[in-house]
């Protein structure tokens, strides 16, 4: 007996061929001998089966001696043995219908679990193998689980169901809801305007939710909420904002915050959380602000940075076009009795300059100028 695998919701075509290449009488029945469809002359006839409104045939093939049974919008319970009667002979086809669905939703927050459940007909013993968009293979029986979803898990999951040496392939589109970056660092000179951007790693038709930016300044003992906002159909509206600093927020996605000026007291790290409607859990993005200040007080030229810097970052003071006078893996460096000229304060990582501040040192009889 021929075995055909079908997918829930799909259309399947079961073939039946006569030796004579012409239109002759045929009938399709199920295992209970209930007539599904057949022909009477050149016309289709239908029986009293439960498939009545979902069964059809390809009439254009009848003259070639082919009498297929087409079943639309397949259901698991359509799994059965179908019998084609033509020319005093019977052809049997066993149809097995499978369904593969994702738990609750295909839009999941980063870190959540994905469970894929296989619906199968009684008596079948299928095996399932799924391949994630990043090429990771998982195997299982009736259910497959992937914990701690990552951003790279977004995309099409391809799952193969194997039964009786036949296979049927399912494609499930999974969207991992997350920010494009888990963390970012902004390096600014004191007084500069600061732009924070929080691009999302997914696109959906309608995006509704609410968010908040909590900030832990390096100099402060506790964190504080800088801004709260609502998101409705991709439109952003500010609910509450602190007076110091007075952040500004863009009205459209991607989420965009502007800090009028970088000051040492703002240096630190923040956590932007976004709670999406109908989703349990929140999206998070960490943002860090490093602020640099170069000053000259009497005979002391000082360069300082505030905020979360890694221990391997190098802070240097050098006279333009000269070797660094001082270079340390510390958050402050200084030069006593600096020579006149344009001094550069550099924050660098393995030779790559992250932040630079210039200060002009005048001969000792005059006051310094900061460009």
């Amino acid at each position: 007996k021929k075995v055909v695998l079908g997918k829930k919701g799909d259309t399947v075509e079961l073939t039946c061929t006569a030796s004579q290449k012409k239109s002759i009488q045929f009938h399709w029945k199920n295992s209970n001998q209930i007539k599904i469809l057949g022909n009477q002359g050149s016309f289709l006839t239908k029986g009293p089966s439960k498939l009545n409104d979902r069964a059809d045939s390809r009439r254009s093939l009848w003259d070639q001696g082919n009498f297929p049974l087409i079943i639309k919008n397949l259901k698991i319970e359509d799994s059965d043995t179908y019998i084609c009667e033509v020319e005093d002979q019977k052809e049997e086809v066993q149809l097995l219908v499978f369904g593969l669905t994702a738990n609750s939703d295909t839009h999941l927050l980063q870190g959540q679990s994905l469970t894929l459940t296989l619906e199968s007909p009684p008596g079948s013993s299928p095996s399932v193998q799924c391949r994630s968009p990043r090429g990771k293979n998982i195997q299982g029986g009736k259910t497959l689980s992937v914990s701690q979803l990552e951003l790279q898990d977004s995309g099409t999951w391809t799952c193969t169901v194997l039964q009786n040496q036949k296979k049927v392939e399912f494609k499930i589109d999974i969207v991992v809801l997350a920010f494009q970056k888990a963390s970012s660092i902004v390096y600014k000179k004191e007084g500069e305007q600061v732009e924070f951007s929080f691009p999302l790693a997914f696109t959906v038709e309608k995006l509704t939710g609410s968010g908040e930016l909590w900030w832990q300044a390096e100099r402060a003992s506790s964190s504080k909420s800088w801004i709260t906002f609502d998101l409705k159909n991709k439109e952003v509206s500010v609910k509450r904002v602190t007076q110091d600093p007075k952040l500004q927020m863009g009205k459209k996605l991607p989420l965009h915050l502007t800090l009028p000026q970088a000051l040492p007291q703002y240096a630190g790290s923040g956590n932007l959380t976004l709670a999406l409607e109908a989703k349990t859990g929140k999206l998070h993005q960490e943002v860090n602000l490093v602020v640099m200040r170069a000053t000259q007080l009497q005979k002391n030229l000082t360069c300082e940075v505030w905020g979360p810097t890694s221990p391997k970052l190098m802070l240097s003071l050098k006279l333009e076009n000269k070797e660094a006078k001082v270079s340390k893996r510390e958050k402050a460096v200084w030069v006593l009795n600096p020579e006149a000229g344009m001094w550069q304060c550099l924050l660098s990582d393995s030779g790559q300059v992250l932040l630079e501040s210039n200060i002009k040192v005048l001969p000792t009889w005059s006051t310094p100028v900061q460009p």
């Epitope: 239109s23 002359g41 050149s42 289709l44 006839t45 239908k46 003259d63």
Partner: antibody, heavy 120, light 107 residues
Framework: QVQLQQSGAELMKPGASVKMSCKAT????????IEWVKQRPGHGLEWIGE????????SYNEKFKGKATFTADTSSSTAYMQLSSLTSEDSAVYYC?????????????WGQGSTLTVSS | DIKMTQSPSSMYASLGERVTITCKAS??????LSWFQQKPGKSPKTLIY???RLVDGVPSRFSGSGSGQDYSLTISSLEYEDMGIYYC?????????FGAGTKLELK
């Protein structure tokens, strides 16, 4: 081009039988079903049945079983319909039509019709 | 048997007017529907098959549409020679059945 030529008008007595013809030209007669349709004023169009000339296979509307009989002569490319035990209810215009190949086209060509009058 | 309900049963229209005739099947007929035109004393002439396919030689002002149970025939700009009776036919299932017809007359 495809043409279906039907026999002329008939005046018959109740209880008699009549055989009308439909001669096909312009295509391979054996390969296409010939349909028969009845039209009576105030009753619209009614499908009587069909014949596949090549095999002689026939199919009848339940309502016309025992009333109509189809035959075909492939040598003359002519299909026939015989109506028996005539009554006034059989007075109508009868059309033959060709069933489109592959069954997608419905009835693609029609004859000009044969008028039958049953009267004593 | 599948019942075909055609409407209106008769209608008056002016030359140049857009005319629509509808046919409703008692069940899904999978677009196996034809439209015919019949003039007094003449045999039916096929205009449309498979719900929307125009027969060769039929003017492009005729068009068919629909799916499932509901179908329509539209004449975009009525001409004098379009007067007559229009019928629909379902040929999805045995036995094929016709609509009762729509008589189209000049206003």
């Amino acid at each position: 081009q495809v043409q279906l030529q039907q026999s002329g008008a008939e005046l018959m007595k109740p209880g008699a039988s009549v055989k009308m013809s439909c001669k096909a030209t312009g295509y391979t007669f054996s390969n296409y079903w010939i349909e028969w349709v009845k039209q009576r004023p105030g009753h619209g169009l009614e499908w009587i049945g069909e014949i596949l000339p090549g095999s002689g296979s026939t199919s009848y509307n339940e309502k016309f079983k025992g009333k109509a009989t189809f035959t075909a002569d492939t040598s003359s490319s002519t299909a026939y319909m015989q109506l028996s035990s005539l009554t006034s209810e059989d007075s109508a215009v009868y059309y033959c039509a060709r069933r489109g190949y592959g069954y997608d086209e419905g009835f693609d060509y029609w004859g000009q019709g044969s008028t039958l009058t049953v009267s004593s | 048997d599948i019942k075909m309900t055609q409407s209106p049963s008769s209608m008056y229209a002016s030359l140049g007017e857009r005319v629509t005739i509808t046919c409703k099947a008692s069940q899904d007929i999978n677009s196996y529907l034809s439209w015919f035109q019949q003039k007094p004393g003449k045999s039916p002439k096929t205009l449309i098959y498979r719900a929307n396919r125009l027969v060769d030689g039929v003017p492009s002002r005729f068009s068919g549409s629909g799916s499932g149970q509901d179908y329509s025939l539209t004449i975009s700009s009525l001409e004098y020679e379009d007067m007559g009776i229009y019928y629909c036919l379902q040929y999805d299932e045995f036995p094929p059945t016709f609509g009762a017809g729509t008589k189209l007359e000049l206003k």
